[in-house]
């Protein structure tokens, strides 16, 4: 790797901050000596900070040590201290703080609502297809197919609870065995981690922020993928999850419990049900091969219905088809029997936007998908902005220390386990791991939480979502209680097994290292993030699905060589880094391969060319659209008027004299001032919480 360039006369900073294994964070450096990373990850340089306009300090800063891109940034407090304010200033500051809090809660509310609507949109677009995945009979015999169906269905409906409830209803109807359901549950666990990865993509505007956010989100993905990689073969060989859960279910005489409390839904439902309401039973019916359900719409039209049970006379082909011998008769031509029918009378229509449009599900889904992504992105940008202006100076130090500091020796190891419990508890409160991990993602991005701390929180979230499922199972009706409880317990023990594999020993925390690696790649080549998402959540599962349909022989024929090549590459990589001398000179590095096989640079050129045509077109688009543009084309020039990428361009072009770009100022007022928008004296109005 090339040495990191330093300024000529600069003396290196004597204090060297290293990130501890347990995620202990360095103390914030002196504000006057603040350093910031450049957005170019290839050659990180020491930055020169433009100091506040009221400071007389020199522009050339003493450079610090080589900056670790994973060190948390210190959010600089440039406001006037509380003690220095007059009464008017203090009152103004107080109300500003209250205003910010209200705004933050408001955006957070709409953020969660948009996640809910995003899930509904995905169900409208792909729900029926998802249901049809389940009706494939090969699931019973092929655990790999079950796994990818679990992934695909959960990705398509954006809800692991939906896919899990389909599995439960199929098991209780004897359409699926618990053994066949376990790989689907594992797949659902993987699929649910796509949501926070999508949320992380929204933070693409700032490279360093994106690096952390994307790594923080994908740590969940890697944990799930690695757990499945190890535990699926173990389960297929030993059926340990099935056996343990069966013993538990049989040893307890469970009575039907109460429904799992809907804590967050109580707040979000009043809003989301005004947008759209879905009849989720349709997906389950399709999964259970109900032909009539295929023509039903997922959009709920009638919310108030009257169900009347009545007996009607129906003709049957022969007396053998009669309900019972005593309920069988003839009119001389046809055989008749009496059938119990449930007559549903529609009373009141639902009160949502799409109730009277009678649009096809795909159209409604597409509209909602676009709108929810825009709202999600907009809310996320605003949350990050507000947090960025609130979490500064002492506030940031207190929060970061509280969240990221370990317990004193010898109890430091307990901190992570407490974080797991916190993650589980929070997920139980919000009733959704997607919501919890998605809310965590921007906090990782702006540097409030380290990846080392986010990891146990995410693992806890995985546990929390299963406790919700266990409660829901205990509330299910008699016939479904046993199967739903066993499946919920399988889910629980799968996550516990995963934690035991990838958490207790710091050395085994592979998901952190893999997520950081992916974060670095994605910060450098931002299109790779989308590529990763498509490959891992769509292409690989779809390929395995296709090959599985073709039969075991095809799957093995293609799979074995692929797995062999992957293992070969990994072994070679390991030898190259640990003991390269044992390898022949040619194999000591990857230079023997063509450039396109060992570097993303040529691919980057291809992607840049491919997206080049879009660069001018999104010029006068809104900020949200621009973020999407930046993500796809990695082009700072494409969004001049919205200014969302322009700053990145300036940061990249000005690397020789690294001056902090206006938008990256921690203080909004100062950034405006630097652009000549606000007079210097106005900076006094800026206020921070402490």
């Amino acid at each position: 790797m090339a040495p990191w360039p330093e300024l000529g006369d600069a003396q290196p900073n004597p204090d060297k901050y290293l990130e501890g294994a347990a995620g202990q964070q360095p103390t914030a450096p002196d504000k006057s000596k603040e350093t910031n990373k450049t957005d170019n990850t290839e050659a990180p340089v020491t930055k020169i900070e433009l100091l506040p306009s009221y400071s007389t300090a020199t522009l050339i800063d003493e450079p610090t040590e080589v900056d670790d891109p994973w060190n948390l940034p210190t959010l600089q407090d440039s406001g006037i201290k509380w003690s220095e304010r007059d009464t008017k200033g203090k009152i103004l500051c107080f109300f500003q703080g209250i205003g910010r809090l209200i705004l933050l809660l408001g955006f957070l509310y709409f953020f969660v609502c948009s996640l809910d609507i995003l899930s509904s949109a995905f169900q409208l677009v792909g729900g029926k297809m998802a249901g049809q995945f389940f009706s494939n009979s090969s699931i019973m015999s092929n655990p790999l197919l079950g796994l990818v169906i679990g992934v695909l269905v959960t990705v398509l409906v954006q809800s692991s609870s939906t896919s899990t409830s389909i599995v439960v209803s199929m098991v209780s109807s004897s359409l699926l065995t618990v053994r066949a359901a376990i790989p689907i549950i594992m797949g659902a666990n993987i699929g649910t981690s796509i949501t926070n990865t999508i949320v992380a993509l929204m933070q693409v505007g700032d490279r360093s922020e994106f690096r952390r956010a994307f790594a923080g989100a994908t740590v969940h993905d890697f944990f799930n993928w690695l757990s499945v990689l190890v535990l699926l073969p173990v389960e297929v060989a030993t059926h340990y999850l099935e056996i343990i859960t069966q013993l538990i279910v049989e040893s307890f005489h469970f009575k039907n419990g109460e429904d799992a409390p809907d804590l967050l839904k109580v707040i979000t439902k009043p809003f989301t049900k005004l947008i759209v309401q879905l009849d989720k039973k349709v997906i389950s019916q399709i999964a259970m091969n109900d032909e009539k359900a295929k023509n039903k719409s997922l959009v709920k039209i009638w919310c108030k219905t009257f169900t009347n049970k009545t007996q009607i006379n129906v003709t049957v082909p022969s007396t053998a088809n009669c309900t019972s011998p005593s309920l069988c008769w003839t009119d001389g031509i046809q055989n008749w029997t009496m059938k119990n029918v449930t007559y549903k009378e529609n009373i009141a229509k639902c009160q949502h936007i799409f109730v009277n449009f009678h649009l096809p599900d795909l159209a409604v889904g597409t509209i909602l998908l676009i709108l929810s992504l825009l709202v999600l992105c907009g809310c996320l940008i605003m949350i990050v902005k507000i947090l960025g202006s609130v979490l500064k100076g002492q506030v940031a130090t207190v929060i970061k220390k509280t969240i990221n500091t370990d317990f004193p020796f010898p109890f430091a190891w307990l901190t992570g386990y407490l974080a797991i419990l916190v993650g589980a508890g929070m997920t139980f409160i919000v009733q959704s791991s997607s919501v919890f991990t998605s809310a965590l993602t921007p906090l990782i991005g702006i540097g409030v939480i380290t990846i080392e701390r986010a990891y146990p929180l995410t693992l806890g979230s995985n546990i929390g979502t299963t406790t919700t499922a266990i409660l829901a199972a205990l509330a299910s009706p008699g016939n479904a209680l046993r199967s739903s409880l066993q499946i919920a317990l399988c889910h629980f023990f799968f996550n516990i097994s995963g934690i035991l594999l990838w958490y207790p020993i710091p050395f085994t925390r592979l998901p952190i290292r893999m997520a950081k690696g992916l974060g670095n790649i994605s910060a450098k080549y931002r299109w790779f993030a989308v590529f990763y998402l498509i490959i891992f959540f769509f292409l690989i599962p779809l390929t395995v699905f296709g090959l599985s349909l073709a039969g075991w022989r095809v799957l093995v024929g293609v799979g074995v060589p692929v797995v062999f090549i992957i293992i070969l590459v990994l072994c070679l990589r390991l030898l190259q880094s640990r003991c390269p001398r044992v390898l022949p000179k040619k194999l000591q590095n990857w230079n023997f391969l063509p450039l396109w096989m060992r570097s993303l640079k040529p691919w980057d050129a291809v992607v840049s060319k491919f997206t080049g045509c879009f660069q001018m077109r999104c010029c006068c688009c809104c900020r949200v659209c621009c973020r999407a543009c930046c993500l796809l084309c990695d082009c700072p020039k494409c969004c001049r008027c919205s200014k969302c990428c322009e700053d990145l361009e300036e940061a990249q072009e000005g690397q020789d004299v690294p001056v902090k770009a206006p938008e990256t100022f921690d203080n909004i007022t100062i950034s405006r001032e630097a652009q000549g928008e606000v007079p210097a004296s106005d900076s006094k109005t800026e206020c921070t919480a402490l």
Epitope: N313, P325, S326, C328, W329, T330, D331, I333
Partner: antibody, heavy 120, light 107 residues
Amino acid sequence: QVQLQQSGAEVVKPGASVKMSCKTSGYTFITYNMHWVKQAPGQGREWIGAIYPGSGDTSYNQKFKGRATLTADKSTSTAYMELSSLRSEDTAVYYCSISTIITTGAVDYWGQGTSVTVSS
Amino acid sequence: DIQMTQSPSSLSTSVGDRVTITCKASQDVGTAVAWYQQKPGQSPKLLIYWTSTRHTGVPDRFSGSGSGTDFTLIIRSLQPEDVATYFCQQYSRIPLTFGGGTKVEIK
């Protein structure tokens, strides 16, 4: 009111065929099943079969299948029964009847009967 | 085929008496049983269907009961105009079958 008017008595030779009619009035002909019942002197009643005039669907007692043919003429609202290969035991009164009690085989309107005598 | 065995084959009783006629099916017919009255030289007349439902215009002295294989027709108070042959019929399975009939006379 509902009326079922059957054709007059027949005297036929063994091995011959007989076709009797049942002209209906007072209801929509195609609505109800038309049943045919045999009542031999001093013996019980036997159900021969039924026809649904609306579609022409028929159903027969296995004992009479192949020998009895039920037809219906919607234009004249008349039902017919043809009995072939007659034997002396076919001597009986044949009734046409309808069931207006939907979906049941309980017949509530009967014709006056057609007497068939099989004699050489 | 389902056999319908009717008993008695004939009975003689006085006006005002209670008359009970039974019908036994060879297999379960549920409640798909009808009762008919046939006077000499006339066509049969439907009295009861679905075991116990009186047809329109049938006096309430006629009642029916039973289910499965055993069925009963009761004439609560015999009247002179009730002199006729009574027979049961099952319509549970094709072919429809009839009972042999019970001839009711007045002493």
